[in-house]
């Protein structure tokens, strides 16, 4: 297993609709054809997997149908979008990239993107 540098923004504020997008960029040492991207969430020192996708270079990322993540790839960059976020989902979202094929296997883990999520203010009741 060889190490690889992964860069991602430090802080992102999700939209009022609970959507956060960020780029995860990896310094590919070679010409990988198969890449796996995993998003991990760290909150209160617990780490959980949010979503994962394996893709062939030049193809779209395919997450599971019920995943809250979508993404696109361009060269050594993966543009990740996480939706359906609420205030309780605020936390550090870590991008993990694995170059699966061809060998050698490379692994890179970013420092994480702190995603802040603000629940929208409830609309005041109105009489019709």
């Amino acid at each position: 297993c060889k190490a690889m540098h992964v860069a991602q923004p430090a802080v992102v504020l999700a939209s009022s609709r609970g959507i956060a997008s960020f780029v995860c960029e990896y310094a590919s040492p070679g010409k990988a054809t198969e890449v796996r991207v995993t998003v991990l969430r760290q909150a209160d020192s617990q780490v959980t997997e949010v979503c994962a996708a394996t893709y062939m270079m030049g193809n779209e990322l395919t997450f599971l149908d019920d995943s809250i993540c979508t993404g696109t790839s361009s060269g050594n960059q993966v543009n990740l979008t996480i939706q359906g976020l609420r205030a309780m989902d605020t936390g550090l979202y870590i991008c993990k990239v694995e170059l699966m094929y061809p060998p050698p296997y490379y692994l890179g883990i970013g420092n994480g993107t702190q995603i802040y999520v603000i629940d929208p203010e409830p609309c005041p009741d109105s009489d019709f």
């Epitope: 802080v11 992102v12 504020l13 997008s21 960020f22 702190q114």
Partner: antibody, heavy 117, light 108 residues
Framework: QVQLVQSGAEVKKPGASVKVSCKAS????????ISWVRQAPGQGLEWMGW????????NYAQKLQGRVTMTTDTSTSTAYMELRSLRSDDTAVYYC??????????WGQGTLVTVSS | EIVLTQSPGTLSLSPGERATLSCRAS???????LAWYQQKPGQAPRLLIY???SRATGIPDRFSGSGSGTDFTLTISRLEPEDFAVYYC?????????FGQGTKVEIK
């Protein structure tokens, strides 16, 4: 080193607007947020809101909603805070601060805004 | 809104003494999102502690933070002359982010 340098002191009349700038250096500007905090004379710190430089999303304190706008110019690594319809109780030192994962660091040197007729 | 109440309002101590500052939240705060700042007259605040207990870069080890839930503490083990200042806690756990009203540590 990481540094935030703010614009100079301003004197404004009630009802006017003020726009304070905060120039960042020593780090990747788009990777962090910028928060604004004010401090009235002899008082404590009041959080005004912040902007996620990466995507331009903002979160304002409710009491200032509609009067405050926070923006950035990524080409010059500068953040701006505009406060409109100024009142005498807006007289304060206004600080910008870099927002990290769970901290404000560093802070700008502060900009005194005086609202007086 | 989460209200942070700091106590005491003023702490009168001598250099070399131990200072214990309290910050109590009106609702539970994730310890990941509680910070402490120091402010001296005419200066901008300076980050001391983040994540309730992690010291910021360049902060001497006489400063320590602890606590969870609604009760947090900043401790200065041995006061140095340069430590006499106002100290603020802040929470980022829930919007709006809020500061405590401050504790002034003054020379006795």
């Amino acid at each position: 080193q990481v540094q935030l340098v703010q614009s100079g002191a301003e004197v404004k009349k009630p009802g006017a607007s003020v726009k304070v700038s905060c120039k960042a250096s020593g780090y990747t500007f788009t990777s962090y947020g910028i928060s604004w905090v004010r401090q009235a004379p002899g008082q404590g710190l009041e959080w005004m809101g912040w902007i996620s430089v990466y995507n331009g999303n903002t979160n304002y304190a409710q009491k200032l909603q509609g009067r405050v706008t926070m923006t950035t110019d990524t080409s010059t690594s500068t953040a701006y805070m505009e406060l409109r319809s100024l009142r005498s109780d807006d007289t304060a030192v206004y600080y910008c601060a870099r927002v990290g994962a769970n901290w404000f660091d560093p802070w700008g040197q502060g900009t005194l805004v005086t609202v007086s007729s | 809104e989460i209200v942070l109440t700091q106590s005491p309002g003023t702490l009168s101590l001598s250099p070399g003494e131990r200072a214990t500052l309290s910050c109590r939240a009106s609702q539970s705060v994730s310890s990941s999102y509680l910070a402490w700042y120091q402010q001296k007259p005419g200066q901008a605040p300076r980050l001391l502690i983040y994540g309730a207990s992690s010291r910021a870069t360049g902060i001497p080890d006489r400063f320590s933070g602890s606590g969870s839930g609604t009760d947090f503490t900043l401790t200065i083990s041995r006061l140095e002359p340069e430590d006499f200042a106002v100290y603020y806690c802040q929470q980022y756990s829930r919007s709006p982010w809020t500061f405590g009203q401050g504790t002034k540590v003054e020379i006795k």
